[in-house]
């Protein structure tokens, strides 16, 4: 891939193993775990990410309420189905023969069942929800300053378009950042929100994704912004399915 | 000029183990993955897995998974797969090959397994 | 894993016609894929790449053609030299295969 330097790396992924054995010659970067070549020119989709991860040595200034049917990942890592296209297939299992269904950032959306269980689509997760702590400061950052350091940060960082970047919001000391990109918004080359929330959510853990690059280095105005607590809400196009048991507990 | 050379035809017993080489010249061996293929007589290519000496990355068949191991040794560009517990099911030809496209390949090495 | 399927399993041909040797993926593997030559007792030889690229030193009587699923090995004149198995083999992801082959005959 052209994005593939001459000394042949991948500057937008890390987890992966790059060698001149390409079409033509050129520098290919497979990733790990997955062994499929990626695109070295945008961000890696993290259903690869996450197998690569498994696999390696190891506007009203109000906060928004996440809706009834958000998503937060409280099952952890696990080793994912990718698609050909390197998306989450719609059922994961695991080893023991137990299945769930997926939405698009390959969160679990239904109740646990066993090999008889059917997803019959992929879900989008159309609307994204970075809710952050920053650590104390010795005042408020200024709202405007914030919004548009994060807004820089998604399109230069992560590439993603500015209009995928709903809204900032702030009440010191939580920052939501609202991602929102419908199957219809999404161009063919456009980063994928989930893909993007994921990128951030790493650097945020120090755990950058990008080769060779420093951590995230937060800043606004100079002034150190430093994430000390992350939650992040995914709503899907259609909403979960899980049984009032889970809903209850 | 690329080349890859194989260790000599093997004949071992049952139950036991052992050790095939390939030592590459003519290219720079950590940035190519190194692959192992297996054939039996009559049959077809079977891929084992491979090894990227640059970083000592390994992937397997799952097939070969607890049957092979690989290992590579960076200073000398030799490659090495131990097999284990052998069986009658493990004789055959096993190639070495530059990956991922394999544009070059050991002569293979023969393997007999018998009592 | 990628499964792939060749057809047929013999081809018998006479000197001087064109033959054409089939691979089916079972999925989307783009271009990744590559033929082999393999004569009695001989090691693999790679003919083509990345589905229709030519390798240095092999004759130009060898052709590739197709992407996605379906993938084509051509000679466009068969000599007698060529009586080999010929395998197909994919390197779009882990674990890699090969085809079960393909046997050509001259009548």
């Known amino acids: 891939h052209t994005a593939a330097q001459d000394n042949c790396t991948c500057p937008t992924n890390k987890m992966t193993v790059c060698s001149p054995d390409g079409p033509g010659g050129r520098c290919q970067c497979r990733a790990l775990g997955s062994g499929m070549a990626v695109d070295c020119s945008t961000l890696t989709s993290k259903c690869l990410l996450l197998k690569a991860r498994m696999s390696a040595p190891k506007n009203a200034r109000t906060l928004v309420r996440p809706s009834e049917h958000a998503l937060v990942d409280n099952d952890g890592l696990y080793d994912p189905d990718c698609d050909p296209e390197g998306r989450f297939k719609a059922r994961q299992c695991n080893q023991t023969s137990v299945c769930w269904c997926v939405n698009s950032v390959g969160v679990r959306r239904t109740d646990k069942g066993d090999l008889s269980l059917r997803c019959d689509e992929l879900v989008r997760t159309h609307h994204i929800l970075i809710d952050l702590r920053h650590r104390p400061t010795a005042g408020a950052f200024n709202h405007s300053d914030l919004d548009a350091e994060l807004r820089r940060l998604f399109r230069e960082r992560y590439r993603l378009h500015p209009k995928f970047v709903a809204a900032v919001h702030y009440e010191q000391p939580t920052i939501q950042i609202e991602l929102r990109q419908n199957t219809s918004q999404k161009a063919a080359g456009d980063v994928d929100i989930g893909d993007a929330a994921y990128y951030f959510e790493r650097d945020i853990k120090g755990e950058s994704l990008f080769q060779g690059r420093g951590g995230l280095d937060l800043r606004v105005r100079g002034e150190p912004l430093q994430v000390e607590r992350t939650l992040i809400y995914y709503l899907d196009e259609i909403p979960p399915k899980f049984s009032m048991k889970r809903l209850t507990a | 000029q690329v080349q890859l050379q194989q260790s000599g035809a093997e004949l071992v017993r049952p139950g036991t183990s052992v050790k095939i080489s390939c030592k590459a010249s003519g290219y720079t061996f950590t940035n190519y993955w190194l692959g192992w293929v297996k054939q039996r007589p009559g049959h077809g290519l079977e891929w084992i897995g491979n090894i990227f000496p640059g970083g000592g990355y390994t992937n397997y068949n799952e097939k070969f998974k607890g049957k092979a191991i690989l290992t590579a040794d960076t200073s000398s560009s030799t490659a090495y797969m131990q097999l284990s517990s052998l069986t009658s099911e493990d004789s055959g030809v096993y190639f070495c090959?530059?990956?991922?496209?394999?544009?070059?390949w050991g002569q293979g090495t023969t393997l007999t397994v018998s009592s | 894993d990628i499964l792939l399927t060749q057809s047929p399993a013999i081809l018998s041909v006479s000197p001087g016609e064109r033959v054409s040797f089939s691979c089916r993926a079972s999925q989307n593997i783009g271009t990744s894929i590559h033929w082999y030559q393999q004569r009695t007792n001989g090691f693999p030889r790679l003919l083509i790449k990345y589905a229709s690229e030519s390798i240095s030193g092999i004759p130009s009587r060898f052709s590739g053609s197709g992407s996605g699923t379906d993938f084509t090995l051509s000679i466009n004149s068969v000599e007698s030299e060529d009586i080999a198995d010929y395998y197909c083999q994919q390197s779009y992801s882990w674990p890699f295969t090969f085809g079960s082959g393909t046997k050509l005959e001259i009548k």
């Open positions: 090959a530059r990956e991922g496209v394999m544009d070059y």
